[in-house]
Amino acid sequence: IWELKKDVYVVELDWYPDAPGEMVVLTCDTPEEDGITWTLDQSSEVLGSGKTLTIQVKEFGDAGQYTCHKGGEVLSHSLLLLHKKEDGIWSTDILKDQKEPKNKTFLRCEAKNYSGRFTCWWLTTISTDLTFSVKSSRGSSDPQGVTCGAATLSAERVRGDNKEYEYSVECQEDSACPAAEESLPIEVMVDAVHKLKYENYTSSFFIRDIIKPDPPKNLQLKPLKNSRQVEVSWEYPDTWSTPHSYFSLTFCVQVQGKSKREKKDRVFTDKTSATVICRKNASISVRAQDRYYSSSWSEWASVPCS
Amino acid sequence: RAVPGGSSPAWTQCQQLSQKLCTLAWSAHPLVGHMDLREEGDEETTNDVPHIQCGDGCDPQGLRDNSQFCLQRIHQGLIFYEKLLGSDIFTGEPSLLPDSPVGQLHASLLGLSQLLQPEGHHWETQQIPSLSPSQPWQRLLLRFKILRSLQAFVAVAARVFAHGAATLSP
């Protein structure tokens, strides 16, 4: 058993049929010694008396808010949550496996630049009695500070018969050094509590590996005289690291109709302009990627050909 | 060329060669996302690798103030990786595929280090750690880790030379 926060405790249980469970001793936070009784949740049934209460925690019915009283007055509370371990593996029931970029990916994180700011998000089908707490650091043995905000519900989607909820959090490294080569990864830890179930999820990454630039901005077309060709120009996204002579991007320019199966024109360039062939009912799209490190491409920025 | 005395390097040549190094490093180990190397206990491998750190002057302001600190750091790293790529970690079993870009990568690391430091001038270099994995599978894992680390190192070096070529060239 360990303390998650004040008056909230996590009991770690091996979860299998007829498991013996964990013996837990609760102590009433009071100077009083006599006349103390214990109850669980809203029940008035007295579970025991005395300054300490010893219980055998085996299942969710044994978890909950234990309260010690004296003469009708509440003295203190202890909330017990369960953390299940099945076949040596901690349960991951609360969050959905996003399966990208690999199986058992529960947290996904992205950064728009090298400033040390990043966003993480996760998915669940649970809509109520759900809380999240996020901590982060650079490195684990001698951790350096990363400050995370509160996790918020950022999207709701309908997936078949189920509703899916997306939560996200923004974090900022306290003393970021955008030009340095990272040697210690960022660690992100999410505590998830659903009713009386506790789970924790972690992710470890370098900012350089989660970079995904915003799409290029200000796409403009200039038809070339006596030609089917069009000069397309664009600018670096505002959110990308500066100066651009140092933090350079490379670009992919594509002309394609509405369907992915249609024919296309495609060219790669390090410049902020390119010449392509425009077709009626097609769009010109441009996306960006770090020029020197193969992290994710941005989403496409598009303009119609006509 | 960047000599210890402080003259300027051939920024454009260094830019071209460092960008080539980036391409080669990713060709040598493209399957980056397919193996989470941090799960394999990185400390003993990459702790000894020379990283370009915050105080090394490789940021745009540091380069403007005095590029020598940064260039020396890059030079150290190039020599370090060049030696690693020439060591039995890469030459031993399992043999690299003959079409592996590691050979070109090795040569290009040497080429860029020579551009930065002509013969006759000597910056102190970092000792190569004695990493002699006994098992072929350990050697394979070590190769992946080294190439991953090299990708990050050459990306910073390429940014430095691109910025230098754009803003510090005579």
Epitope: R228, Q229, T250, R261, E262, K263, K264, D265, R266, V267, F268, T269, D270, T275, I277, R279, K280 | S27
Partner: antibody
Framework: EVQLVQSGAEVKKPGATVKISCKAS????????LHWVRQAPEKGLEWMGW????????EYAPKFQGRVTITADTSTDTGYLELSSLRSEDTAVYYC???????????WGQGTLVTVSS | DIQMTQSPSSVSASVGDRVTITCRAS??????LHWYQQKPGKAPKLLIY???QSISGVPSRFSGYGSGTDFSLTINSLQPEDFATYYC?????????FGGGTKVEIK
Amino acid sequence: EVQLVQSGAEVKKPGATVKISCKASGYTFSDYYLHWVRQAPEKGLEWMGWIDPENGDTEYAPKFQGRVTITADTSTDTGYLELSSLRSEDTAVYYCAANKELRYFDVWGQGTLVTVSS
Amino acid sequence: DIQMTQSPSSVSASVGDRVTITCRASQSISINLHWYQQKPGKAPKLLIYFASQSISGVPSRFSGYGSGTDFSLTINSLQPEDFATYYCQQSNSFPLTFGGGTKVEIK
């Protein structure tokens, strides 16, 4: 199977015009760009131009501008190359090539030898 | 026009050898570079597109690499059917241009 079948060899006099055909099969003709590339004896490859069969848009290499016409007939799934004012240095194998991507060539015809000789 | 220079113009090699052909562009072309194989009396065949992307059905012994102005095609463990002429082609800008070709001959 995507295939391009070209018309047979031609012998032409200098100053004449040649028209070669390229019949597509195994795909929707207008879904691919069609290019023409030539190769002089013992020489390298030289791109001449392309057509989008869907709308008839064309682009020619400056070297051939004014002398070359590329057309496409969607009713017969056939592309054509017409080269006028022939000279001896136009003696070459002419290939049609197609792809969904405009700038490189995925599928090739077998080639048509055009000999220009007086 | 962008000039593409291939080297060597010919190379003699034996079955099992590793052969590397290089292609240099007269200006930077990013990764807009493609490789073809041509056998005598036959049409060219696409091997690699956008510098390093492999084509399904093309043996994995063919690999491409490069960016900017310098590119290479490597044939690892040359097979009897690989004796042919190889061409690079840039697609950075029109007109599309090819290298002069590299003939891989039997030693």
